[in-house]
Interface confidence: low
């Protein structure tokens, strides 16, 4: 038989025995001559090196490039392939020789002791036990022990081949400690050598690279990549690395087994690739492949090598971030850089520290953004090696959906006397300011609940048919004033006012404000009454501990049964089918109050006195009167606010000052408190008395000293006092210059 491809110029070596297989008896002589066209060599079984004393290779006497192989007294072990080949080529001729030795039908291995077969428990894998035969057509079985089992060829997955050995699915003998082949010749049994069975694993669970991603270095730095393979037990692993600059001088590979906990069902192998000083050519994909023979798993990572440390902002870095109050805001610091920069955030120049409301890291996170978060945020990136800095400013604009100030008045609004002019107000705070504030209205009776409609606390008016205020037919004559802008509580607010020129009919009014992030609305109950009238005596808001009287006056000829009620702090749920306003129709929520009746010639006056008013007395007071003829009830509501007592405070400080003789000094002392405090001035702890040069104005708030003299120098004190105590501020006035001499001197 010929092996290899024929060369153009060389013919295959020619053997003296022109057969693929030669069968000879033991103890005979084997002789084969090989002729060719250049130098030849022989290879034979059990000694591939070419030095065996029994085997003789001689040059032929009759020609160049000819060699004869002779083995006298062949034995079974000489069975195998005999190859004649041209040196340094793969051109060869082969003959397979069987030496039939019925006493030793199996070819013994070189060691002649025992062999080893490695198997895996994989169902699909077969193993070959290399019990080769010196006779081609033997009846061979495989014996495994312990326990003893015999396997015979089945024409399928179990077979024996004299040139190869015994083939069997590996799982069938994985239990065994040893196996051997057995041949039966004329009722005699012949055994091959013993083969120890070693079960090896093959499963690789995973291959993990560390670091796994985002590996960045600068030229000259050391790269260390760890590749860990986790496998089942009894596995041997070969690692293979692929990387950009394979011919690296400073590359080092170390492979080792890692210890695992006793009783662990897995093994760990580690391969470490180290490059001491990376160059730009080391940038690229690094792949670690772990192979167990039957299985290969690999993992890759990209290594980026920078010329030098650097830092820069990424193109996606925002300059303007818009958010709505209450939202979570995330501003990521998008950067390119090596090594990763230190990141510091500032707001309007002040460093930001992380707390429960704000997280200042790679991403600036404001958990629940509020108006005060509006501003310029500066992020500064610092390269930890080069100390290079880059900064970027992000403007955060926090939008506020329209909030209507008066909406916080949760109680029903007062009733309005028939025929009067009234102004309704919506004070809107929004960022950006509202695009528009629109007013709508509808008749009170049109807004009565259908029995099927429940009224919610948030929307007590189940009204749908709102009409534009331009269309006031059937309602009150209305005029919407141009929006005003006012600074209220330090905020720019938009004030929209609606003027009802004559309160003729009860209606509901709605103001609706819209800006780019939302809308807000307020529904105002405008209940018109021809009935009783409420007045407050004295006609001002009372302060705690002061007394106040609520007077309800009604025409005696029209009304009777005047009664005072107070609206409960938390009205009872409104029942289906009932109207939330006017309160007259729902007396369940009212508390009856004691009052005193007075009369004059035309009116009944029901007076309800509150002595020593307290904050608990605040609320909505209802006067109910009944029409003498129709018995219809008429209600009037008046909201009473009781001012809290507040100890005096002085806003602002008096400043020490130096003034020249003859000039004027003007200082002011603004005090607040409830009841309003009295202001007094002292000079050097003596009460300051007004004269031609010392003027006190605006309830002593403003002090003017005209044409100051040297004797005006001293410690001035402003003191504000009420029943709740005093507050004071002091300043020293220095008077410079010489006093002009008067003519009298």
């Amino acid at each position: 038989a010929s092996v290899g491809l024929p060369s153009v110029s060389l013919d295959l070596p020619r053997l003296s025995i022109q057969k693929d297989i030669l069968t000879i008896k033991a103890n005979t002589t084997l002789q084969i001559t090989c002729r060719g066209q250049r130098d030849l060599d022989w290879l034979w079984p059990n000694n591939q090196s070419g030095s065996e004393q029994r085997v003789e290779v001689t040059e032929c006497s009759d020609g160049l490039f000819c060699k004869t192989l002779t083995i006298p007294k062949v034995i079974g072990n000489d069975t195998g392939a005999y190859k004649c080949f041209y040196r340094e080529t793969d051109l060869a001729s082969v003959i397979y020789v069987y030496v039939q030795d019925y006493r030793s039908p199996f070819i013994a291995s070189v060691s002649d002791q025992h062999g080893v077969v490695y198997i895996t428990e994989n169902k699909n894998k077969t193993v070959v036990i290399p019990c080769l035969g010196s006779i081609s057509n033997l009846n061979v079985s495989l014996c495994a022990r312990y326990p003893e089992k015999r396997f015979v060829p089945d024409g399928n997955r179990i077979s024996w081949d004299s040139k190869k050995g015994f083939t069997i699915p590996s799982y069938m003998i994985s239990y065994a400690g040893m196996v051997f082949c057995e041949a039966k010749i004329n009722d005699e049994s012949y055994q091959s050598i013993m083969y120890i069975v070693v079960v090896v694993g093959y499963r690789i669970y995973d291959v993990v690279l560390s670091p796994s991603h985002g590996i960045e270095l600068s030229v000259g730095e050391k790269l260390v990549l760890n590749c860990t393979a986790r496998t089942e037990l009894n596995v041997g692993i070969d690692f293979n690395w692929e990387y950009p600059s394979s011919k690296h001088q400073h590359k080092k590979l170390v492979n080792r087994d890692l210890k695992t906990q006793s009783g662990s069902e897995m093994k760990k192998f580690l391969s470490t690739l180290t490059i001491d000083g990376v160059t730009r050519s080391d940038q690229g994909l690094y792949t670690c492949a772990a192979s167990s023979g039957l299985m290969t798993k690999k993992n890759s990572t990209f290594v980026r090598v920078h010329e030098k440390p650097f830092v820069a902002f990424g193109s996606g870095m925002e300059s303007l971030v818009e958010a709505t109050v209450g939202e979570r805001v995330r501003i990521p610091a998008k950067y390119l850089g090596y090594p990763p920069p230190e990141i510091k955030w500032y707001k309007n120049g002040i460093p930001l520290e992380s707390n429960h409301t704000i997280k200042a890291g790679h991403v600036l996170t404001i958990m629940e953004v509020s108006e005060r978060d509006t501003g310029n945020y500066t992020v500064i990136l610092t390269n930890p090696i080069s100390k290079e800095k880059q900064s970027h400013v992000v403007s955060l604009v926090v939008y506020v959906p329209p909030q209507i100030g008066e909406k916080s008045l949760i109680s029903p609004v007062d009733s309005y006397q028939y025929g009067t002019t009234q102004t309704l107000t919506c004070t809107v705070y929004a960022i950006p300011p509202p695009h528009h504030i629109h007013w709508y209205w509808q008749l009170e009776e049109e807004c009565a609940n259908e029995p099927s409609q429940a009224v919610s606390v948030t929307n007590p008016y189940p009204c749908e048919e709102w009409r534009s205020v331009e269309d006031f037919q059937g309602g009150n004559k209305i005029e919407v004033n141009k929006n005003q802008f006012a600074l209220i509580e330090g905020k720019n607010k938009t004030v929209s006012t609606l003027v009802i020129q004559a309160a003729n009919v009860s209606a509901l009014y709605k103001c609706e404000a819209v800006n780019k992030v939302g809308r807000g609305e307020r529904v105002i109950s405008f209940h018109v009454t021809r009935g009783p009238e409420i007045t407050l005596q004295p006609d001002m808001q009372p302060t705690e501990q002061e007394s106040v009287s609520l007077w309800c006056t009604a025409d005696r000829s029209t009304f009777e049964n005047l009664t005072w009620y107070k609206l409960g702090p938390q009205p009872l749920p409104i029942h289906v089918g009932e109207l939330p306003t006017p309160v007259c129709k729902n007396l369940d929520t009212l508390w009856k109050l004691n009052a005193t009746m007075f009369s004059n010639s035309t009116n009944d006056i029901l007076i309800m006195e509150l002595k020593n008013a307290s904050l608990q007395d605040q609320g909505d007071y209802v006067c109910l009167a009944q029409d003498r003829k129709t018995k219809k009830r008429h209600c009037v509501v008046r909201q009473l606010t009781v001012l809290e007592r507040v100890a005096p405070t002085i806003t602002g400080n008096l400043e020490n000052q130096t003034t020249s003789i003859g000039e004027s000094i003007e200082v002011s002392c603004t005090a607040s408190g409830n009841p309003p405090p009295q202001i007094m001035w002292f000079k050097d702890n003596e009460t300051l008395v007004e004269d031609s040069g010392i003027v006190l104005k605006d309830g002593n708030r403003n002090l003017t000293i005209r044409r100051v003299r040297k004797e005006d120098e001293g410690l001035y004190t402003c003191q504000a006092c009420s029943v709740l105590g005093c507050a004071k501020v002091e300043a020293f006035f220095i008077i410079e210059g010489a006093q002009e001499k008067t003519n009298l001197e």
Partner: antibody, heavy 120, light 109 residues
């Protein structure tokens, strides 16, 4: 991804009422931060705003069309509709529905438009 | 109503050139409420700029907007072949109606 799709007859007779529906998918018409508008464009001409609606039913109309326009919303079907009465040939146009970021604000998502021809 | 006048009506330029489109309002418009759109034949308008100078999502940075009061400008720094289209400005001020400009057609020279 938010999508808007106009539907309705492509041909309407003069003096009749033009009716179109816009179906919103990939988002809710009940969003409190979005308004929904109709815009039209006569062939070869510019854009004209018709009107806008909020999910609650509040409407804002172009004063020049106010007497003839009705825009309504059906939150259960995620749709809003346009009715334009007493049409004439001058109402022939491509009608677009769009999302307004808020009332009288920019239109950021548009339908592909539907051509309505007014002809007898 | 606020009338928006766009100029020029047609702008003939070559790819790579800079385009400057003007939008003038008949009365002052808050800069928060001016937008620009691009429209190609057979397509719906596409939002480019809102609040005078803010690019909408996905709009390349060659498009920029500026202006205040009554004068507003859309600039395309370097025209790409896909930029040839009709451009509309739109105001969304405090009083109805919302109005669009008459449009500027940017065509290939």
């Amino acid at each position: 991804q938010l999508q808007l799709q106009e539907s309705g007859p492509g041909l309407v007779k003069p003096s009749e009422t033009l009716s179109l529906t816009c179906t919103v998918s990939g988002g809710s018409i009940s969003s409190r931060s979005d308004y929904w508008g109709w815009i039209r464009q006569p062939p070869g001409k510019g854009l004209e705003w018709i009107g806008t609606i909020y999910y609650s039913g509040d409407t804002y109309y172009n004063p020049s069309l106010k007497s003839r326009v009705t825009i309504s919303v059906d939150t259960s079907k995620n749709q809003f509709s346009l009715k334009l009465s007493s049409v004439t040939a001058a109402d022939t146009a491509v009608y677009y529905c769009a999302r307004q970021q808020l009332v009288l604000y920019y239109f950021d998502y548009w339908g592909q438009g539907t051509l309505v021809t007014v002809s007898s | 109503e606020i009338v928006l006048t766009q100029s020029p009506g047609t702008l003939s330029l070559s790819p790579g050139e800079r385009a400057t489109l003007s939008c003038r309002a008949s009365q002052s418009v808050s800069s928060s409420y001016l937008a620009w759109y691009q429209q190609k034949p057979g397509q719906a308008p596409r939002l480019l700029i809102y609040a005078t100078s803010n690019r909408a999502t996905g709009i390349p940075d060659r498009f920029s907007g500026s202006g205040s009061g009554t004068d507003f400008t859309l600039t395309i720094s370097r025209l790409e072949p896909e930029d040839f289209a009709v451009y509309y400005c739109q105001q969304h001020g405090s009083s109805p109606p919302l109005t669009f400009g008459g449009g500027t057609k940017v065509e290939i020279k």
